[in-house]
């Protein structure tokens, strides 16, 4: 035979190929050996022109020999040399992960090495490289960023030889959102109990706002911006009060139109309304909700109803906010004055959740027309908002 070559070399395999002998032969005898590796001999059919070498040692120079046999006759031997690849380290793992540190551990390759190349990269593209000694099987990473996804890779080195890289992915602990802009981000940070939280409008730490987060209704992550429950708070307030907000966030309150404008300007939000009365419950969800700025007189956008309470908010869509001292509704009379409340009145209301608590006179009370009509004041009502894509964010967090 002639033209002996090797191909497809890995750390444990290679493929030997040759040109067949001109004469017809019975068989070929292949043998291969390396330093500290006993010789292996195999006989293959005379029709064969390649042979897969397996169970090789990594990073080892092999000498490969082949000759042909026909009966008692043997051809001359041809020889080729090849070196197997350096095998990779194994089981790279990140442990003891903290906000700024992590410990990488691995098992060494079978081949002897002169060192390891460690590469770790954060999602923002920051890459760091470090070379460690041949006897090292762990390395402490420091100066990491909190709440950051990292990819760590390791490669074995032996002189000019380099193994394939293996990798592991980890996330440093700490807040996913150091300055959560709403209750959904607070929830994604791991806070799952309803109560008072500080959010930061537009994620700006200078724009802190204390809010009540509902972390249980339909998956949670809701900023509650209105609560009626006992009639202790006066909701017949003026324009200035409704712009700024009033009440106790743990009890009855209104978060404020300026805050609603700033929150809904952060992205696409959905509205949820929860109603409760003598053991009965109902809800309404609108998948698009926003409140304009003061120049628009806090114009309401509310679209895409689903729920059990009935679509009473559609009537108010596109309306500006009205109070007894700033009449922006489309009625000749002042709706806020007539119904002793404030709302995005038209002429006048199907929803009057800021009406007089417990007042069952027509249209005067806490009303949601398509649930309890205008002659029944609802005992408990909450209005709340969260990002429309919260379900996607929540799924991503669970996968992570």
């Amino acid at each position: 035979p002639s033209g002996l070559v090797t191909a497809n070399i890995t750390d444990s395999e290679a493929l030997a190929r040759w040109q067949p002998a001109i004469a017809t032969v019975d068989s070929y005898v292949i043998s291969y050996t390396g330093e500290k590796v006993p010789e292996i001999t195999r006989t293959v059919s005379g029709n064969t022109v390649e042979y897969a070498l397996t169970d090789l040692e990594p990073a080892t120079e092999y000498t490969l020999r082949i000759f042909a046999e026909k009966g008692p006759q043997k051809s001359s031997t041809i020889t080729a040399k090849f070196t197997t690849d350096l095998d990779s380290p194994r089981d790279l793992t990140a442990t003891e992960v903290q906000s700024e540190t992590a410990l990488l551990t691995w098992r060494p390759p079978r081949a002897s090495v002169t060192g390891y190349l460690l590469v770790y990269e954060s999602v923002d593209g920051t890459v760091k490289e470090v070379i460690v000694g041949p006897d090292t099987t762990s390395y402490s990473l420091a100066d990491l960023s909190p709440s950051t996804h990292y990819t760590a890779k390791i490669q074995a080195l032996n002189g000019p030889l380099r193994s394939n890289m293996i990798q592991t992915i980890f996330t440093t602990i700490g807040l996913l959102y150091p300055f959560p802009k709403d209750c959904s981000q607070a929830m994604l940070n791991g806070d799952t109990t309803s109560g008072l939280y500080t959010i930061y409008l537009n994620g700006d730490k200078a724009e802190a706002l204390e809010v009540f987060c509902d972390m249980t209704s339909d998956g949670g992550g809701w900023i509650v911006f209105l609560r009626r429950k006992n009639g202790r708070e006066n909701f017949y307030q003026n324009w200035k009060a409704y712009a700024a907000g009033f009440g106790d966030r743990r009890e009855e309150f209104w978060l404020g139109l300026d805050n609603l404008n700033k929150i809904t300007a952060q992205g696409q939000y959905e509205l949820r309304v929860d109603l409760r009365d003598h053991g009965e419950t109902a809800f309404a969800v609108y998948d698009k909700f926003s409140v304009g700025d003061a120049k628009t007189r806090y114009k309401l956008k509310v679209e895409g109803y689903s729920g059990t309470a009935g679509d009473s908010m559609a009537y108010h869509n596109g309306r500006s906010f009205s109070t007894f001292d700033k009449d922006t509704d489309s009625a000749i009379t002042n709706c806020a004055l007539s119904y002793k409340g404030a709302f995005w009145y038209r002429n006048c209301h199907r929803v009057n959740l800021m009406g007089r608590y417990g007042d069952n006179n027509h249209s005067q009370g806490v009303n949601w027309f398509h649930w309890k009509g205008h002659e029944h004041s609802i005992q408990f009502a909450e209005m709340k908002l969260r990002p429309s894509n919260f379900r996607n964010l929540e799924g991503r967090r669970k996968r992570a």
Partner: antibody
């Protein structure tokens, strides 16, 4: 421009069925509730049925409940009224109308109507 | 169902006169009241919604007022093109109901 065009009216015997259609153009059809209103010859207006923008909620006058079915195909910008078990008192000009904003609201756009005559 | 009662049923009026049509609801409906004009052989046309809001393109001689149960449509100076039948309609609750109509004709 905004337009509603009804079709499907005609002469039908009592007890038979008819399906009215209304083709809408010039506005975002699925944003608005739609209604059918009828007017018997020489008489006033009578609301018949309504349907929300998504089609998820439907409403009927007592006089047609159980006999008429309102539906819509938002992909085709079309409103329908399936009328079964027709009676002589259903004879009227049937108008399709667009709701101004919410499901129960003013009707700001009307079609020209399609005549349904129920007679043996 | 809410009954809507219009008066008068017929109103012969000279051109240029002021016209007042009233509509009464059988129960309190806030301002959920609309007015329509219908000419013979034509579809109704929305004039006033929410008791007092003039629909786009409707002349300013038309106006609406009222709240609760009693409502009024006023034409400040009747023009020849205003001779028609006028209907009130409540959109407060389903079924939405119309008044029986008021025919304004030439005196």
């Amino acid at each position: 421009q905004v337009q509603l065009v009804e079709s499907g009216g005609g002469l039908v015997q009592p007890g038979r069925s008819l399906r009215l259609s209304c083709a809408a153009s010039g506005f975002t059809f699925d944003d608005y509730a739609m209604h059918w209103v009828r007017q018997a010859p020489g008489k006033g207006l009578e609301w018949v049925s309504g349907i929300s923008g998504s089609g998820g909620s439907t409403y009927y006058a007592d006089s047609v409940k159980g006999r008429f079915t309102i539906s819509r195909d938002n992909a085709k910008n079309s409103l329908y009224l399936q009328m079964n078990s027709l009676r002589a008192e259903d004879t009227a000009l049937y108008y399709c109308a667009k709701s101004y904003q919410s499901d129960e609201d003013a009707f700001d756009i009307w079609g020209q109507g399609t005549m349904v005559t129920v007679s043996s | 169902d809410i009954q809507m009662t219009q008066s008068p049923a017929s109103l012969p009026t000279p051109v240029g006169d002021r016209v007042t049509i009233t509509c009464r609801a059988s129960q309190y409906i806030q301002g959920f009241l609309n007015w329509y004009q219908q000419k013979p052989g034509k579809a109704p046309k929305l004039l006033i919604y929410d008791a007092s809001n003039l629909e786009t393109g409707v002349p300013s001689r038309f106006s609406g007022s009222g709240s609760g149960t009693d409502f009024t449509l006023t034409i400040s100076s009747l023009q020849p093109e205003d001779f028609a039948t006028y209907y009130c309609q409540q959109s407060y609750s389903t079924p939405q109901t119309f008044g029986q109509g008021t025919k304004v004709d030439i005196k």
